[in-house]
């Protein structure tokens, strides 16, 4: 969470952003809120990106003003126009690219004053892993697959029964580049699996951490997946 305040001139207003991460090829949200104003026509929202010459997005007098927008953001940005009046300046970014990562500034002008706050936006690829029993293998084997990750993650196996055990010598992980030549498919195989145990395949990079669990008993197989974004802290 980053809270910024206005500077000289008019009164300052509080602007708040939250660090976030975008999944390449999907839509993302850059969060920004501010002290609301009663008149929409008095609110100006400017989104800027460090290292980029043009604006990311501008909203003023109740509508988008995109004459100064940099072409790398052309047709890919939108604010939630109906929520600006209640202090939501968040930006929707369509078709997130790797190069959208960076430091953004949410700059607000209202009749009460000015304010801005920075936001660190990370981009990459992350997806839920699925763990299955590999019946094709010669011994009891688990196969953990996740279709899209970037940057290259680490993969660690754990088990409920053998807590703290190091499975690196009985597992094998590979990374296969996807067709767009950026993201990769993650495949990790765990050998010598015992029955009546719960195994976890944990995939992590600096953007996200995902876990795929599988519980193997004589009577059933239960699966569960979880993904958590690792937001960078305020600085």
């Amino acid at each position: 969470l980053i809270i910024g305040f206005g500077i000289s001139g008019r009164h300052s207003i509080t602007v708040t952003t939250v660090a976030s991460a975008g999944n390449i090829g999907e839509d993302g949200i850059l969060s920004c809120t501010f002290e609301p104003d009663i008149k929409l026509s008095d609110i100006v929202i400017q989104w800027l990106k460090e290292g980029v010459l043009g604006l990311v997005h501008e909203f003023k007098e109740g509508k988008d003003e995109l004459s100064e927008q940099d072409e790398m953001f052309r047709g890919r940005t939108a604010v939630f126009a109906d929520q600006v009046i209640v202090g939501n300046a968040s930006l929707r970014l369509k078709n997130v690219q790797l190069t959208d990562a960076g430091t953004y500034k949410c700059y607000i002008i209202t009749s009460k004053g000015k304010g801005n706050a920075n936001l660190e936006y990370k981009t990459g690829a992350f997806s839920m892993p699925e763990v299955n029993v590999d019946y094709n293998a010669s011994s009891e084997t688990l196969r953990c697959e996740a279709p899209r990750w970037f940057p290259q993650p680490t993969v660690v196996w754990a088990s409920q029964v053998d807590q703290g055990a190091n499975f690196s010598e009985v597992s094998n992980t590979s990374f296969e580049l996807n067709s767009e030549n950026v993201t990769m498919k993650v495949v990790s195989v765990l050998y010598n699996v015992t029955i009546n145990n719960t195994y976890s395949c944990m995939i992590e990079n600096d953007i996200a951490k995902a876990t795929g669990d599988i519980k193997v008993t004589e009577s059933e197989i239960k699966r569960r997946s979880h993904l958590q974004l690792l937001n960078s802290k305020a600085s």
Epitope: L53, S67, E68, Q69, E71, T99
Partner: antibody, heavy 126, light 113 residues
Framework: QVQLQESGPGLVKPSETLSLTCTVS??????????WGWIRQPPGKGLEWIGT???????YYNPSLKSRVTISVDTSKSQLSLKLNSVTAADTAVYYC??????????????????WGQGTLVTVSS | DIVMTQSPDSLAVSLGERATINCKSS????????????LAWYQQKPGQPPKLLIY???TRESGVPDRFSGSGSGTDFTLTISSLQAEDVAVYYC?????????FGQGTKVEIK
């Protein structure tokens, strides 16, 4: 304050490979907001863009040099490097590394150079 | 490639007087969809690397004195130093960033008369 420092041999023989390194300090080369580039300036002449790289490794080269040039990045050392092979006397120049503040025109990443290294003179001679 | 041609090649101006440098591009660097001119100006003092002065043809880089100004559109651009100071002695380059490869003018040397 971002600082860039070029290093490498000052003398290269014709037909050999010119290799230079640029070390970035006061800011991370893996900053996702910036691109990095190489520009050269023959003695007493103007500036020529060689190429540009993003921290992920994406490269953009001047078509006139593309067949001979390789730019790479080592984010762990905060360095970018330039290799120019089959050099001739015409490659004698001061070589600069610089940070690129970008824009996009019709799908092409391009921009202005806002921070420069001091430059290193490379002479091609036997 | 877009060819950038500067004039004059050198210029001698008295201290406190106005210096004007011209830059012409072989094709327009004005992008009609956003009405921006993709042109920058740099200053290079002897033994130093170039320093960014102006981008978008007329936007001054942070920290650049306001005696430096840029103007023009399309193919014809001008860098003006309104009141020449001793520290302004340098070679000045224009650069287009409208199309790849980015290209520079041949430079204009500014001296004190």
């Amino acid at each position: 304050q971002v600082q860039l420092q070029e290093s490498g041999p000052g003398l290269v023989k014709p037909s050999e490979t010119l290799s230079l390194t640029c070390t970035v300090s006061g800011g991370s080369i893996s900053s996702s907001s910036y691109y990095w580039g190489w520009i050269r300036q023959p003695p007493g002449k103007g500036l020529e863009w060689i190429g540009t790289i993003y921290f992920s490794g994406n490269t953009y080269y001047n078509p006139s040099l593309k067949s001979r040039v390789t730019i790479s990045v080592d984010t762990s050392k905060s360095q970018l490097s330039l290799k120019l092979n089959s050099v001739t006397a015409a490659d004698t120049a001061v070589y600069y590394c610089a940070r690129l503040r970008v824009t996009m025109v019709r799908g092409v990443i391009i921009g202005v150079f806002d921070y420069w290294g001091q430059g290193t003179l490379v002479t091609v001679s036997s | 490639d877009i060819v950038m041609t500067q004039s004059p090649d050198s210029l001698a101006v008295s201290l406190g007087e106005r210096a004007t440098i011209n830059c012409k591009s072989s094709q327009s660097v004005l992008y009609s969809s956003n009405n921006k001119n993709y042109l920058a100006w740099y200053q290079q003092k002897p033994g130093q690397p170039p320093k960014l002065l102006i981008y978008w043809a007329s936007t001054r880089e942070s920290g650049v004195p306001d005696r430096f100004s840029g103007s023009g559109s399309g193919t014809d651009f001008t860098l003006t130093i309104s009141s020449l100071q001793a520290e302004d002695v340098a070679v000045y380059y224009c650069q287009q960033y409208y199309s790849t490869p980015p290209t520079f003018g041949q430079g204009t040397k500014v001296e004190i008369k």
